[in-house]
């Protein structure tokens, strides 16, 4: 499997409509919670929680602050922590508790605390519960949590130093935690947790399961350096701990290795960054997508692997266990356990079969079973990805977060659309297309290229968004920018399952937002643009330039997978002669203009789609070069109205008699690269057209004409 290609299109921050939310002096917007029924997005940041309109996050609905007292700050600083950064209250848990309240925990200057947030008054109830084991002490430490039926399941560190890891359930009647032992958790970095509900029609009376995902230091491999291993662990919701052995500890905690590697190249991705559980009506069993990087990541590699939850469950239900062994000079401390396995099966949830054998609760489990699971929490079998290979491997990028949406294209094909954020504030949208990856687009969400810390996907039909949180704020982006594709070819070549071309309106439309039936819409996920209707009209831009000047003809081809070439009259130009140059690989520069340069210029692009090369005419320009007699009057500006109700500018610049000839606006360097002098600042007020007068008075006027195009096949 090859590396994923570059994103087809790059949208700069200013190019697309993104909605932003940030408050002055508030940072670390890392906890996001969406209430779809209320159309509200809750945002947990440093020392604050906000409620904003989920359809327009710039509209703040409520805010509440949870600051640390000066006394607490001082005590924290005495322990060697930074008063300006660490000794503050970073909101780390933001979970729904009931229809009217949220459960919120913060680091609270290294004294983690939790409280209930009333959604009606948007005030904390002042419970000030001890957050130990639910929320990290240190804002830099890893954490994850999920609320299941009013009980908080968390993975974090249990002490000030962060040296004691814990997976716990905060419950009034049955609190549970992991054993503090290396075989259970060995310096884990927690990533994600979620509940997987039992299927309603399950015959064996099975239990809901809570899954935890983390990276930890390997116990099974011991080399010169610490080997990191990505893990999936699970506990049963009905677990109540053991009666004597594993009292108030999980009796159902099992963990297994997650495999994400590229077998043909020996590339192993062993650091887990994020996980997304994809639930969809069409999926019998959820699929989880995991985002990885390699441990030694000096080249910026990232990978996404997808797993069937049933594969993981199979490992836990029927897989072999590992057991520690003391073998001299062996790298492997843990080996496969081949001995007898006690019944009921260690780590199994209490199901109908167990109940039939009179094991109605984990408190009834025999000591043999409990002792075994205490000593053998690690499975020997690994959880392998769908198709035994990554869905995506990308070079020169560090991905940070992932969300996935399952959508149906016009032809009925189902696509899992991966939205993956980067450590430079961008969002990639990718799909698998015929055993290859197509990165549809990259959107620069954050202007200052800061890492995306949190990603959230709305699942409500109609208005759908991706929300991204970073240190400086939250950005809301639509799932697709269909309207930005101006032609049928562009719309089809985008190969975006959310977009289709509508011939009646001659626009690229978002499929999920069209109320009308999809009849007549054009979408071709193969990228076959020949399905597009012939363009009978070609739009030409007409320019008038001064003799001796330099012209720059624009070619707005957005695709990073395309390259362009230019035609003049009917010949193909080679844009690296003394006469021509390319600006930004797209725009044509014509130097030392003369009458012979007058005529029709066309920019064509070539873009490979599979083994086909798609050619399209991107821009057409009519150039007219005129010898302008030297005016004797002072410089004048006149604005003329031209066809198409566009304002074109007429610029006349007087030159002093006897002055040296004007310097060209563009110089070609020996390497063939083009250097442009800095542009003078635009003049004029907001109600005047802004006119830039270069040293060479090039632009005389410009207009758009529509000519019958005869050269489209």
């Amino acid at each position: 499997m090859a590396f994923a290609p570059i994103p087809r299109i790059t949208w700069e921050h200013r190019e697309v409509h993104l909605v932003q939310f940030h408050e002055p002096d508030i940072y670390n917007y890392s906890a996001l919670l969406l209430s779809e029924d209320k159309d509200t997005l809750y945002i947990g940041a440093r020392e604050a929680v906000f409620a904003v309109n989920a359809l327009n996050i710039s509209e703040k609905q409520h805010e509440v602050y949870w600051k640390v007292s000066e006394d607490k700050k001082a005590k924290c600083a005495e322990k060697g922590k930074s008063k300006q950064t660490e000794c503050l209250n970073y909101i780390r848990v933001l979970q729904p508790l009931s229809a009217t309240s949220l459960y919120v925990c913060g680091t609270n200057a290294f004294q983690p605390a939790c409280d209930h947030l009333n959604l009606t008054s948007f005030k904390f109830l002042g419970k000030n519960e001890d957050g130990k084991g639910r929320c990290p002490f240190d804002p830099a430490h890893s954490y994850t949590s999920v609320m299941v039926d009013g009980e908080l399941y968390s993975g974090t560190s249990y002490n000030f130093l962060g040296s004691e890891p814990i997976i716990s359930r905060n419950s009034s009647h049955s609190p549970l935690r992991t054993e503090y032992a290396i075989p259970w958790l060995n310096e884990p970095s927690f990533v994600f947790a979620d509940v997987i509900r039992k299927s309603p029609d399950s015959p064996d009376g099975e239990d809901d399961r809570v899954y935890f995902f983390f990276t930890e230091v390997s116990v099974e491999y011991e080399f010169v350096f610490r080997v990191l291993i990505p893990r999936i662990a699970r506990v049963c919701k009905g677990d109540q701990g053991g009666l004597r052995t594993l009292q108030k500890k999980w009796t159902s905690f099992l963990k297994a290795r997650l495999i994400c590697s590229r077998p043909d190249s020996g590339l192993v991705f062993n650091v887990l960054r994020d996980v997304f559980v994809l639930r969809s009506p069409g999926l019998k069993v959820p699929v989880f997508y995991a985002l990885f990087t390699p441990q030694l990541n000096n080249v910026g590699l990232s990978a996404v692997c997808a797993y069937n939850l049933s594969t993981a469950e199979e490992v836990f239900s029927h897989g072999k266990y590992m057991q520690s062994t003391t073998v001299e000079q062996s790298h492997t401390k843990w080996v496969r356990y081949n001995g007898p396995v006690p019944k009921p099966r260690p780590g199994a949830c209490i199901d109908s079969e167990a109940r039939a054998a009179n094991y109605t609760s984990s408190l009834n489990l025999p000591d043999k079973t409990l002792q075994f699971v205490k000593d053998h929490p690690l499975m020997d079998d690994s959880v392998t990805p769908i198709d035994n290979r990554p869905r995506l491997i990308k070079k020169d990028v560090n991905y940070t977060q992932i969300v996935v949406d399952r959508t149906q294209a016009l032809d009925g094909t189902v696509y899992d659309v991966m939205f993956v954020s980067t450590d430079r504030g961008a969002l990639h949208k990718a799909i698998s297309l015929e055993h290859a990856v197509h990165i549809i687009e990259e959107t620069q969400l954050f202007q200052d290229f800061e890492p995306v810390q949190t990603l959230l996907l709305s699942s409500k039909k109609g208005n759908r968004f991706v929300y991204a949180g970073s240190n400086s704020g939250v950005v809301q982006a639509p799932l697709a920018f269909c309207g930005k594709h101006g032609t049928c070819e562009d719309c089809v070549l985008a190969r975006d399952p959310y977009c289709a071309w509508s011939p009646p309106t001659a626009t690229c439309v978002a499929l999920h937002q069209t109320e009308s039936p999809s009849r007549g819409l054009i979408q071709e996920m193969s990228g076959d643009a020949s399905v597009c209707p012939d363009k009978s009209k070609g739009s030409y831009r007409q320019h008038f330039f001064k003799h001796g000047g330099t012209a720059e003809l624009k070619c707005s081809q957005k695709s990073n997978l395309a390259r362009v070439f230019w035609k003049f009259q009917n010949g193909v130009l080679k844009a690296e002669s003394p006469k021509y140059g390319l600006m930004g690989r797209k725009n044509l520069l014509i130097f030392n203009l003369s009458e012979g340069d007058s005529g029709v210029y066309q920019c064509l692009s070539e873009e490979r789609v599979k083994n086909k090369t798609v050619f399209q005419v991107v821009a057409k320009h009519v150039l007219e070069v005129k010898v302008v007699p030297k005016p004797v009057v002072a410089p004048t500006l006149s604005v003329v109205q031209t066809e198409g109700s566009r304002i074109a500018t007429k610029v006349l610049v007087a030159s002093t008699q006897g002055s040296s000839p004007p310097t060209p606006a563009v110089q070609a360097t020996s390497s063939g690269a083009i250097t442009l002098p800095p542009k003078p600042a635009p003049t004029g007020t907001s109600c005047e057209p802004k006119i830039v007068i270069n040293t060479v008075p090039q632009l005389h006027s410009e207009k758009t004409m529509y000519l019958k195009s005869s050269d489209n096949r």
Partner: antibody
Framework: EVKLVESGGGLVQPGSSMKLSCTAS????????MAWVRQVPDKGLEWVAN????????YYVDSLKTRFIISRDNAKNILYLQMSSLKSEDTATYYC???????????WGQGTTLTVSS | DIVLTQSPASLAVSLGQRATISCRAS??????????MHWYQQKPGQPPKLLIY???NLESGVPARFSGSGSETDFTLNIHPVEEEDAAIYFC?????????FGGGTKLEIK
């Protein structure tokens, strides 16, 4: 003056691997697509692969895409062709060429000869 | 794949006369008025050298006695007047579809 110099050819056993290099000078390397084209002695030319400006989009002739990897190092102005599981039919002169839109090759190296034989 | 058939396989032309080489594609290589056929010259022990790109555009530094024409599936390379140094093998190449393919070559001898 545009100059392309291939290296890395030679005699190898079937099944083995080989990496060809092409050092470019006289032009801004990162502003051009680059390609490998091969020629069996006294036979025709066969396009092997090409690569876009920054090296993220390689393309191959179908029959070679599982065995050959084209890559580039823009900092060093070098184009590479990593070949594995070599067969006798890979014996050819391998040319590195500058690939210009719409798909022609305006400058070629002198070529490096690869012989795959036991 | 698009197959390019060159004819003749070889030809001998007297000095100063016209040499005409034909290249026929198995399907059209023209689109949007652009003809994606290119011509190269190769002399023994040397790499190919670009002569004509996009059917009729003369590469800089190539003598004006070389010219190209054609559209869709039929293309022609003309050399007039032929000179001694033109003895070589001439190849056509298409770039409308992957893989870019070359013709089998036409050997030009000077009588």
């Amino acid at each position: 003056e545009v100059k392309l110099v291939e290296s890395g050819g030679g005699l190898v056993q079937p099944g083995s691997s080989m990496k060809l290099s092409c050092t470019a000078s006289g032009f801004t390397f990162s502003d051009y697509y680059m390609a490998w084209v091969r020629q069996v002695p006294d036979k025709g030319l066969e396009w092997v692969a090409n690569i876009n400006y920054d090296g993220n989009n390689p393309y191959y002739v179908d029959s070679l895409k599982t065995r050959f990897i084209i890559s580039r190092d823009n900092a060093k102005n070098i184009l590479y062709l990593q070949m594995s599981s070599l067969k006798s039919e890979d014996t050819a002169t391998y040319y590195c060429a500058r690939d210009i839109s719409p798909g022609y090759f305006d400058h070629w190296g002198q070529g490096t000869t690869l012989t795959v034989s036991s | 794949d698009i197959v390019l058939t060159q004819s003749p396989a070889s030809l001998a032309v007297s000095l100063g006369q016209r040499a005409t080489i034909s290249c026929r594609a198995s399907e059209s290589v023209s689109i949007h008025g652009t003809h994606l056929m290119h011509w190269y010259q190769q002399k023994p022990g040397q790499p190919p050298k670009l002569l004509i790109y996009a059917a009729s555009n003369l590469e800089s530094g190539v003598p004006a006695r070389f010219s190209g024409s054609g559209s869709e599936t039929d293309f022609t390379l003309n050399i007039h007047p032929v000179e001694e140094e033109d003895a070589a093998i001439y190849f056509c190449q298409q770039s409308i579809e992957d893989p870019h393919t070359f013709g089998g070559g036409t050997k030009l001898e000077i009588k």
